[in-house]
Interface confidence: low
């Protein structure tokens, strides 16, 4: 008996070849002996089976002695033994229909679990192997699970079902819904405009949801919602925004926020959450703001930074084109009685300058100028 594997929803062609290369009387029936399809001369006749509206045959091939049975929109319950009787010949084909589906949706939030479930006909004992877009192989029986989906899991998963030394391949497109970056940090001098961008790592035709940016300023005891917004078909509309700071938001994707000016009281960490329509859970991106201020008060030149800095960051004060006068892994440095000239305050990481602020120190009879 010939075995043919089919995929749920697909179309399958079961072949039946007569020894005589001409159109002769034939019919197909199932294991229940119910007629499915046959011919009346050069015309097709359909039997009373429940497949009635989903079966066909290639009439153009009858003259060559080929009597195919085409079953469209395959269902698991179509799995059966199909018998072709042509002239005095009889051919049997065992059709096994499999389905592979993602647990709920193929659009999953980062960190969620993906469960692939194999639907198979009774009496079959298939094995399944899936390969993720990043080349990771997983094996299983009726179900395969991948926990903690990552961004790299987005793409086409290729799954092979093996049964009776035959195989059928499924391709499932999985979209992991996440921001491109889990976290970002913006370094700004006091007074500068701040741009926060939250690019998504996926594209969908219609994107609807709502979001909010919560901000924990370093100086504040509790976090505060800075802005809430809606997203409808990739168009952004602001619902509510604080008066201080008054953030502005771009109307198109990627999500883009502008803080008119960086001030020490705004330095801190934010968490942008995006809840997508019909999805449980939220997308998150952390954003950090580090603000630098260089000031001269009487005989003291001070440089300070506010916000989430790593302990390995170095804060330095130096006179232009000279060695650093002071360099510390701290959030404030100062020089007493600084000599006149252009001073630079530098925040650096392993020699790479992240933020720089210049302040001109005038001879002692003048007041300082901040460029």
């Amino acid at each position: 008996k010939k075995v043919v594997l089919g995929k749920k929803g697909d179309t399958v062609e079961l072949t039946c070849t007569a020894s005589q290369k001409k159109s002769i009387q034939f019919h197909w029936k199932n294991s229940n002996q119910t007629k499915i399809l046959g011919n009346q001369g050069s015309f097709l006749t359909k039997g009373p089976s429940k497949l009635n509206d989903r079966v066909d045959s290639r009439r153009s091939l009858w003259d060559q002695g080929n009597f195919t049975l085409i079953i469209k929109n395959l269902k698991i319950e179509d799995s059966d033994t199909y018998i072709c009787e042509v002239g005095d010949q009889k051919e049997e084909v065992q059709l096994l229909v499999f389905g592979l589906t993602a647990n709920s949706d193929t659009h999953l939030l980062q960190g969620q679990s993906l469960t692939l479930t194999l639907e198979s006909p009774p009496g079959s004992s298939p094995s399944v192997q899936c390969r993720s877009p990043r080349g990771k192989n997983i094996q299983g029986g009726k179900t395969l699970s991948v926990s903690q989906l990552e961004l790299q899991d987005s793409g086409t998963w290729t799954c092979t079902v093996l049964q009776n030394q035959k195989k059928v391949e499924f391709k499932i497109d999985i979209v992991v819904l996440a921001f491109q970056k889990a976290s970002s940090i913006v370094y700004k001098k006091e007074g500068e405009q701040v741009e926060f961008s939250f690019p998504l790592a996926f594209t969908v035709e219609k994107l609807t949801g709502s979001g909010e940016l919560w901000w924990q300023a370093e100086r504040a005891s509790s976090s505060k919602s800075w802005i809430t917004f809606d997203l409808k078909n990739k168009e952004v509309s602001v619902k509510r925004v604080t008066q201080d700071p008054k953030l502005q938001m771009g109307k198109k994707l990627p999500l883009h926020l502008t803080l008119p000016q960086a001030l020490p009281q705004y330095a801190g960490s934010g968490n942008l959450t995006l809840a997508l329509e019909a999805k449980t859970g939220k997308l998150h991106q952390e954003v950090n703001l580090v603000v630098m201020r260089a000031t001269q008060l009487q005989k003291n030149l001070t440089c300070e930074v506010w916000g989430p800095t790593s302990p390995k960051l170095m804060l330095s004060l130096k006179l232009e084109n000279k060695e650093a006068k002071v360099s510390k892994r701290e959030k404030a440095v100062w020089v007493l009685n600084p000599e006149a000239g252009m001073w630079q305050c530098l925040l650096s990481d392993s020699g790479q300058v992240l933020l720089e602020s210049n302040i001109k120190v005038l001879p002692t009879w003048s007041t300082p100028v901040q460029p």
Epitope: K232, N233, K234, E235, S237, K251, K252
Partner: antibody, heavy 118, light 111 residues
Framework: QVQLVQSGAEVKKPGASVKVSCKAS????????ISWVRQAPGQGLEWMGE????????YYNEKFKGRVTMTRDTSTSTVYMELSSLRSEDTAVYYC???????????WGQGTLVTVSS | DIVMTQSPDSLAVSLGERATINCKAS??????????MNWYQQKPGQPPKLLIY???NLESGVPDRFSGSGSGTDFTLTISSLQAEDVAVYYC?????????FGGGTKVEIK
């Protein structure tokens, strides 16, 4: 203030097409969705579809798919609704309506009567 | 599509009396704690005017004698004290699911 001004009444023969315009003013044209809603004489209201003036993307009620086309001209802040293969049952007042915070239909045009008659 | 059924078709109420209009959706129009139901008033020869949005929120400029209530599938528009200028046709409309659908309308007259 927000204003939606529609083109004048039209009389069409069955099988013809009609194109109704809706000129928006008093707000940022690209910021709000504009819908088209029709009302047959003495009947209720029926949503035909909507257009996003920013992108030009439009979404239609299944009932009108294949017969309705919604377009926009950002240079004149005007939205157009074209209905083809007109039949007598398309005789109605056609309204454009702009969305707001609470609803899809906050601001309405004055309506355009389209009469389909042989 | 969600089917909206309004009752009654018409209503005659004395000036100063309460008028109540009901609307039933074929399926729930609730989402995330809100009911996506709006109410409109339409006078002859005029476009509809939004009165109530999201079941119970009064649109700006609408007199507070109008109120909306309900959730899930059953909603009510109430005019607490009918005025002469309230004579109109009132429509409910769901905005949860495309296509947005309207009720058949309720004509309010003075008794």
């Amino acid at each position: 203030q927000v204003q939606l001004v529609q083109s004048g009444a039209e009389v069409k023969k069955p099988g013809a097409s009609v194109k109704v315009s809706c000129k928006a003013s008093g707000y940022t044209f690209t910021a709000y969705v504009i819908s088209w809603v029709r009302q047959a004489p003495g009947q209720g209201l029926e949503w035909m579809g909507e257009i996003y003036p920013g992108s030009g993307s439009s979404y239609y009620n299944e009932k009108f798919k294949g017969r309705v086309t919604m377009t926009r001209d950002t240079s004149t802040s005007t939205v157009y609704m074209e209905l083809s293969s007109l039949r007598s049952e398309d005789t109605a007042v056609y309204y454009c309506a702009r969305s707001g915070d609470g609803s899809r239909f906050v601001y309405w045009g004055q309506g355009t009567l389209v009469t389909v008659s042989s | 599509d969600i089917v909206m059924t309004q009752s009654p078709d018409s209503l005659a109420v004395s000036l100063g009396e309460r008028a109540t209009i009901n609307c039933k959706a074929s399926q729930s129009v609730d989402y995330d704690g809100d009911s996506y139901m709006n109410w409109y008033q339409q006078k002859p020869g005029q476009p509809p005017k939004l009165l109530i949005y999201v079941a119970s929120n009064l649109e700006s400029g609408v007199p507070d004698r109008f109120s909306g209530s309900g959730s899930g599938t059953d909603f009510t528009l109430t005019i607490s004290s009918l005025q002469a200028e309230d004579v109109a046709v009132y429509y409910c409309q769901q905005s949860l699911q495309d296509p947005p659908t309207f009720g058949g309308g309720t004509k309010v007259e003075i008794k």
